[in-house]
């Protein structure tokens, strides 16, 4: 039975040209995290595998930095980066947990972090 929950940074906003940290955290389970995949709608951004380290997709390699931890830093933001991002935790023996983050990239300097929230 899957007992874990994923806590994410929730709905966040950032300024165009700036950077943002996408962060998820898996709790309430003793399952071993074998890999975390980061995706944006229909594109893979990066994979962090416990044994192999990081894979950064070529379309993002110039502006995605691994970490901190299992998170991902997205740099040189554009308005086109607005949208949903998913952290997909591959665990043993539980299986897969998915968290969702919505990023809004703003033209002005009114960017503020949203509240944290949980997805079971």
């Amino acid at each position: 039975m899957m007992t874990g929950t994923i806590e994410t940074t929730g709905n966040i906003s950032a300024e165009k040209g700036g950077s943002i940290i996408l962060q998820c955290h898996l709790s309430s389970t003793t399952a071993q995290v074998t890999q975390v995949n980061w995706e944006q709608q229909d594109q893979l951004l990066a994979i962090c595998n416990a044994d192999l380290g990081w894979h950064i997709s070529p379309s993002f390699k110039d502006r995605v930095a691994p970490g901190p931890g299992l998170g991902l830093t997205l740099q040189s933001l554009t308005v086109n980066d607005t949208g949903e991002y998913f952290c997909i935790y591959h665990t043993y023996p539980d299986g897969t947990y998915t968290g969702r983050i919505f990023l809004e990239v703003l033209e002005s300097s009114v960017a503020e972090h949203g509240a944290r929230f949980q997805i079971p």
Epitope: L44, D51, S57, S59, P66
Partner: antibody, heavy 119, light 107 residues
């Protein structure tokens, strides 16, 4: 120039073991991942596993657990595939392939090592 | 394990024709797919990755597309030297897996 040079063809008896080598040159060995692939005559490619020579971390295809052991010697830039309890089903070409840095895209391949298990 | 299914084991085409090879993943693999070419007696060669980027030195007649579970590899104007087996491969989750291969035959 990046190169992966594999050891030569092997003819071995059933029940024995063999160690295939893959020597890397032209790059920082510990910045690469090395994967191993198996191909029986006239058949497709099958993934055996992958090793991170920097950390020693390995991942295996469940099918090859107990059959294959992946190791790497950082001092000599050599990755090894050891195969044990050999049977005729293990007769195949074994390839090593390398992927640089933050990538799981394997763009450098060895020439292949032919293993024949026969009594 | 994720199964990568290439529906055609063989495809026959003529020089100058366009040909497409399809690959279907048994579950979501996002864009973590590459295509290899293996000519008789040779090691596989990386052609396309991620899954629409052409590897260095690969002619622009080779293209790839897809996301999620459905992927396509296309040769826009087949040349005689394209006689080979083409494999799709996913690295979305371990164990990484290959498609069964599609052998391209030139009429």
């Amino acid at each position: 120039q990046v190169q992966l040079q594999q050891s030569g063809a092997e003819l071995v008896s059933p029940g024995t073991s063999v160690k295939v080598s893959c020597k890397a040159s032209g790059y920082a060995f510990t910045n690469y991942l090395i994967e191993w692939i198996y191909q029986r005559p006239g058949q497709g490619l099958e993934w055996i596993g992958v090793i991170n020579p920097g950390s020693g971390g390995t991942i295996y295809n469940e099918k090859f657990k107990g059959k294959a052991t992946l190791t790497a010697d950082k001092s000599s830039n050599i990755a090894y595939l050891q195969l044990s309890s050999l049977t005729s089903d293990d007769s195949a070409v074994y390839f090593c392939a390398g992927s640089y840095g933050s990538s799981y895209t394997f763009d450098y391949w060895g020439q292949g090592t032919t293993l024949t298990v026969s009594s | 394990d994720i199964v990568m299914t290439q529906s055609h084991k063989f495809l026959s085409t003529s020089v100058g024709d366009s040909v497409s090879i399809t690959c279907k993943a048994s579950q979501h693999v996002s864009t973590a797919v590459v295509w290899y070419q293996q000519k008789p007696g040779q090691s596989p060669k990386l052609l396309i990755y991620s899954p629409s980027y052409r590897y260095t030195g690969v002619p622009d007649r080779f293209t790839g597309s897809g996301s999620g579970t459905d992927f396509t590899f296309t040769i826009s104007s087949v040349q005689a030297e394209d006689l080979a087996v083409y494999y799709c491969h996913q690295h979305y989750s371990t164990p990484w897996t290959f498609g069964g291969g599609t052998k391209l035959e030139i009429k």
